[in-house]
Amino acid sequence: TLNSVLNSNAIKNLPPPLGGAAGHPGSAVSAAPGILYPGGNKYQTIDNYQPYPCAEDEECGTDEYCASPTRGGDAGVQICLACRKRRKRCMRHAMCCPGNYCKNGICVSSDQNNFRGEIEETITESFGNDHSTLDGYSRRTTLSSKMYHSKGQEGSVCLRSSDCATGLCCARHFWSKICKPVLKEGQVCTKHRRKGSHGLEIFQRCYCGEGLSCRIQKDHHQASNSSRLHTCQRH
């Protein structure tokens, strides 16, 4: 169903062109937190990082997972830990940084062939494209040549964040990928659940701006998982 699509964390596992150049560190092509800067939050430094208590992965930032800070430690004391880069050991998808997933105990790059069929099947079922075929989405995001001569303004279609003007990133918005503003403090952000690729996220938000990370709104702890809001908060 569309709800399961929206509540999944397929973004980090999408093949190009949907999720940008997955698995290529430094490629500024993403639409969501963590994809733009695989392997860690660009804005998060060791100096200002404060351990954030958590009970589950989705309470952490996009480039983090929830676990005990010490191996074999007390499961009741868990904090958000930095995600693991490619070739590092893992026990579940959430432990791996965006653009990677856990396979046979190792974080490996999300590979186009692994997910394309599943994504197309999900999106076709959910949206029932009226007058066109999917063709791996390349048809949906092909740009007018004009896009390459001037930076895209808010709401204009894009392929990657570099197509957009300063302060904007390229993010899916229902039907298309468009230039959206980088998020400010207090604005709603998307926290990807990173449980593997179980469909395509129809919407994407930009990442949180400098000095901010996407965390669960404290007054929403009692709400159900699917309705809890995450906002950009100071580290």
Epitope: T1, L2, N3, L6, N7, S126, F127, G128, N129, D130, H131, S132, R139, R140, T142, L143, S144, K146, M147, S150, G152, Q153, E154, G155, S156, V157, H173, F174, W175, S176, I178, K180, G186, Q187, V188, T190, I202, F203, R205, S226, S227, L229
Partner: antibody, heavy 118, light 112 residues
Framework: QVQLVESGGGLVQPGGSLRLSCAAS????????MSWVRQAPGKGLEWVSV??????????YYAASVKGRFTISRDNSKNTLYLQMNSLRAEDTAVYYC?????????WGQGTLVTVSS | DIALTQPASVSGSPGQSITISCTGT?????????VSWYQQHPGKAPKLMIY???NRPSGVSNRFSGSKSGNTASLTISGLQAEDEADYYC???????????FGGGTKLTVLG
């Protein structure tokens, strides 16, 4: 500034046809998805259709109430959006707005009134 | 059919704050952390006031704010002014055939 100007509305009999146009200016038309939204007299807003930024073979979506009767299209060389309405019914009577679909419907035209009546 | 439910009318005095609710289901508003709000003055086209739950487009007063909890979204207008008197519509996305859904609209009256 962004400007959208609809035209083509008027009185038409049930079962008849009408073609609405929307002339766009002030932005790169070919870089935006575009929609039609309508509003029956004294009623709320109802989304009608949307079309991809490309004008040849682009993706289109329709509300269930108009699917099979209405066709959305665009001509990027003319910066114009169209809505071909066939088999019109009394319940299609409304002001039809052309809207730019950027981050949601971020710019709207002034609307054109379509009256379906015998 | 109106997919999202809004109160038909709300009112407030200048300077006060008012909140307009918008209730949907898990198939639309509740299934997305995306909701937009539009302002429409009589005889005019709608204007986007809030998108993505709580984001304001440039040029929209910071007196307008949005929030969402579960299947209900809210638009709050603080420091009510006479020019705020208008109809307000919420909008979300939905699964199924109707991919875009609007609320039935709320008429805001600024008293006095």
């Amino acid at each position: 500034q962004v400007q959208l100007v609809e035209s083509g509305g008027g009185l038409v009999q049930p079962g008849g046809s009408l073609r609405l146009s929307c002339a766009a200016s002030g932005f790169t038309f070919s870089s935006y998805w575009m929609s039609w939204v309508r509003q029956a007299p004294g009623k709320g807003l109802e989304w009608v259709s949307v079309i991809e930024h490309k004008d040849k073979g682009g993706t289109t979506y329709y509300a269930a109430s108009v699917k099979g009767r209405f066709t959305i299209s665009r001509d990027n060389s003319k910066n114009t959006l169209y809505l071909q309405m066939n088999s019109l019914r009394a319940e299609d009577t409304a002001v039809y707005y052309c809207a730019r679909h950027g981050i949601d419907f971020d710019h709207w035209g002034q609307g054109t009134l379509v009256t379906v009546s015998s | 059919d109106i997919a999202l439910t809004q109160p038909a009318s709300v009112s407030g005095s200048p300077g006060q704050s008012i909140t307009i609710s918008c209730t949907g289901t898990s198939s639309d508003l509740g299934g997305y952390n995306y909701v937009s709000w539009y302002q429409q003055h009589p005889g005019k086209a709608p204007k986007l006031m809030i998108y993505d739950v709580n984001n304001r487009p440039s040029g929209v007063s910071n007196r307008f704010s949005g929030s969402k909890s579960g299947n209900t979204a809210s638009l709050t207008i603080s420091g009510l002014q006479a020019e705020d008197e208008a109809d307000y519509y919420c909008q979300s996305y939905a699964s199924g055939n109707t991919k875009v859904v609007f609320g039935g609209g709320t008429k805001l009256t600024v008293l006095g």
